[in-house]
């Protein structure tokens, strides 16, 4: 399944919007830094693009869920957040077509499911962290930076798989 050329552009726009959303300096939040244990290997050990796409879809779905809570709405600029939703929604649509098209073509569907579970657990850790930090501005800034990093890593891995093929 070939993703539209606009998908890569959408990923870049998503990262750009995440960068623009920054409200405070991460340096003022050093005491709140946290290792969320991004499951990078779940994007790197899937040898076929068809196996990575559902995992990337899950990643974007979870980002969408995280930023569409009422606590998130209170933390970020509404206009930027709306643009961010639009970008994520478009990417989910692109990937969904490939997920449906790729059903049954993966080498080990249960490996893919374990990867999806690993992504869900990663976001559970992020949600728990925000809750424990009472959704403070610094906690949200740490999470924003983390999502930028993990989203960038996962899309880069997806791109490198695409270029290999």
């Amino acid at each position: 399944c070939d993703l539209p050329q606009t998908h890569s552009l959408g990923s870049r726009r998503t990262l750009m919007l995440l960068a623009q959303m920054r409200r405070i300096s991460l340096f003022s939040c050093l005491k709140d830094r946290h290792d969320f244990g991004f499951p990078q290997e779940e994007f790197g050990n899937q040898f076929q693009k068809a196996e990575t796409i559902p995992v990337l879809h899950e990643m974007i779905q979870q980002i969408f869920n995280l930023f569409s809570t009422k606590d998130s709405s209170a933390a970020w600029d509404e206009t930027l957040l709306d643009k961010f939703y639009t970008e994520l929604y478009q990417q989910l649509n692109d990937l969904e077509a490939c997920v449906i098209q790729g059903v049954g073509v993966t080498e080990t569907p249960l490996m893919k499911e374990d990867s999806i579970l690993a992504v869900r657990k990663y976001f559970q850790r992020i949600t728990l962290y925000l809750k424990e930090k009472k959704y403070s501005p610094c906690a949200w800034e740490v999470v924003r930076a983390e999502i930028m990093r993990s989203f960038s890593l996962s899309t880069n891995l997806q791109e490198s798989l695409r270029s290999k093929e």
Epitope: N45, Q61, E107, M111, E113, L117, R120, K121
Partner: antibody, heavy 115, light 113 residues
């Protein structure tokens, strides 16, 4: 503490349908996959199918396609198995199991269905 | 569909003995991407639901005694109990965790003499 609580035993007339429930506590079903497994008296285990409660996507063993329907309600943290028009072959213990980490790592206590 | 053949059907042993049971798959359960074998072992004691023992052919589930060891690669797998205890009386099932539909072996019944 992770637990899967299944509904009570069912006595069903052949041809009638029955809906079994599996309620999770200690975790969100939308963060996992829920499987259903059948075990006839003194027999082995047969996989029926599974659901990803986060999106409702299901997979079934071809032998159960059309005879069993798996659904989930994330608001009540419950998964369901509906058996339509069962025959005497449907007499069995039905287990729900969740894939929280790897494989089917948590199991319900089982529901006995007698047709 | 992947077929799993377990042997023997029944094992009758004395407490303290070492036992091995076999599970053979009709096709390879090895994933080339992560080099893991997608075979799982479950233990089912009388009147209880199955319990996960081993996943990825050799990884012991947390809380499972270290007398249980899973081994094997590709199509041939083994579950070993180094020193059988009375509480190990159960049926042991292997399961294809590689592809849908998921399939189970017919089971090996462990009896204690």
């Amino acid at each position: 503490h992770v637990k899967l609580q299944q509904s009570g035993a069912e006595l069903v007339k052949p041809g009638a349908s029955v809906k079994l429930s599996c309620t999770a506590s200690g975790f969100n079903i939308k963060d996992t996959f829920i499987h259903w497994v059948k075990q006839r008296p003194e027999q082995g285990l047969e996989w029926i199918g599974r659901i990803d409660p986060a999106n409702g996507y299901t997979k079934y063993d071809p032998n159960f396609q059309g005879k069993a329907t798996i659904t989930a309600d994330t608001s009540s943290n419950t998964a369901y198995l509906q058996l339509s028009s069962p025959t005497s072959e449907g007499t069995a213990v039905y287990y729900c199991a969740s894939r929280v980490d790897y494989a089917m790592d948590y199991w319900g206590q089982g529901t006995t269905v007698t047709v | 569909d992947i077929e799993l053949t377990q042997s023997p059907a029944t094992l009758s042993v004395t407490a303290g003995e070492k036992v091995t049971m076999s599970c053979k798959s009709s096709q390879s359960l090895l994933n080339s991407g992560n080099q893991k074998n997608y075979l799982t072992w479950y233990q089912q004691k009388p009147g209880q639901p199955p319990k996960l023992l081993i996943y990825w052919a050799s990884t012991r589930e947390s809380g499972v005694p270290d007398r249980f060891t899973g081994s094997g690669y590709g199509t041939d797998f083994t579950l070993t109990i180094s020193s059988v205890q009375a509480e190990d009386l159960a049926v042991y099932y292997c399961q294809n965790d590689y592809s849908y539909p998921l399939t189970f072996g017919a089971g090996t019944k462990l009896e204690i003499k």
